[in-house]
């Protein structure tokens, strides 16, 4: 009789282990589903926002190749300009080539004429090197033409077809840049 009870107990324990294993599998499966659901929702969200705005650039932005540009209608100091661009999902303009510089200056001539526009260029306080806001160095042909005499922080701006420098605390218009949406064809 003792042997019978012992056998039943072992069977029950085995059943319990199997149930625990099944529960564990179910929990894992549920977690996996939740994760997939999260990614699916994220994908849907991005797809919907792209479908809703199928043009490569938002309204009032100018497109050139893979970039969209926004020319501000307000003045601000360099640091505030940087923040204003981030709010719109962009950064201050980072000019990568002479072709891009020509496009920008040509567009500015058409839009506004000869004003000052902050770009994402500033001088390192210690080394005096010019750097884009992501830490990269501008190509030699894209360095500000004149060195500002300011003892304060110095930042870069575009005027007419030149790249110039000025105290970062002066007020200017600014240009933001973001990637253009790729059409999913």
């Amino acid at each position: 009789k003792l042997l019978q009870v012992s056998t039943i107990a072992m069977q029950q324990q085995e059943k319990l282990i199997q149930q625990e294993r099944a529960l564990l599998n179910f929990t894992e499966w549920k977690r996996s589903c939740a994760l997939q659901m999260k990614y699916c929702q994220a994908f849907m969200q991005n797809s919907l926002s792209s479908a809703h705005n199928s043009s490569p650039c938002p309204n009032n932005w100018i497109q050139n190749r893979e970039s969209c540009y926004y020319v501000s209608e307000i003045w601000s100091i360099w640091h505030t300009s940087q923040e204003n661009c981030l709010k719109e999902g962009s950064t201050l303009l980072q000019i990568e080539s002479k072709e891009e510089m020509d496009f920008i200056t040509g567009s500015l001539r058409k839009i506004k004429g000869s004003y000052d526009y902050w770009v994402g260029l500033s001088q390192d306080g210690h080394s005096g090197r010019w750097l884009w806001q992501d830490g990269s160095s501008p190509s030699p042909g894209l360095l500000p033409a004149e060195r500002s005499q300011s003892a304060n922080q110095v930042c870069g701006y575009v005027k007419s077809n030149s790249l110039l420098s000025s105290n970062c605390s002066t007020w200017k218009y600014f240009i933001c840049e973001k990637y253009a949406l790729r059409s999913s064809v």
Epitope: A42, Q45, N46, L86, K87, E88, S90, Q133, D134, E177
Partner: nanobody, 116 residues
Framework: QVQLQESGGGLVQAGGSLRLSCVAS????????MVWYRQSPGKQRELVAG???????TYANSVRGRFTVSRDIAKSTAYLQMNTLKPEDTAVYYC??????????WGQGTQVTVSS
């Protein structure tokens, strides 16, 4: 509504490193940007670094070359790796998120203290 939770602050010696994390309650790839700010007593809040939804990066002049901003979309988390810390980096560090309508959402902040 976007909820943000910062962590990783603490006390560190000058020259040391810290890594701040900011976990968001939404998919961060769908946000306009995630931005790190800091504020020290009696000073204005200042932008430290930011990363846009498409991955563009920007740094404040004072931290460029020392701090690195990054993100993990799968974990809905933005990071701020802070190296070669200086006493003047002492501040409360805040994480902010800007949604598609440029509305700002803020975390509660995490204290970073750099001793000399």
């Amino acid at each position: 509504q976007v909820q943000l939770q910062e962590s990783g602050g603490g006390l560190v010696q000058a020259g040391g490193s810290l890594r701040l994390s900011c976990v968001a309650s939404v998919n961060i790839g769908s946000l306009n940007s995630m931005v790190w700010y800091r504020q020290s007593p009696g000073k204005q809040r200042e932008l430290v670094a930011g990363i846009t939804g498409s991955g563009q990066i920007t740094y404040a002049n004072s931290v460029r070359g020392r701090f690195t901003v990054s993100r993990d979309i799968a974990k809905s988390t933005a990071y701020l790796q802070m190296n070669t810390l200086k006493p003047e980096d002492t501040a409360v560090y805040y994480c902010a998120a800007y949604d598609r309508s440029a509305t700002a959402y803020w975390g509660q902040g995490t204290q970073v203290t750099v001793s000399s």
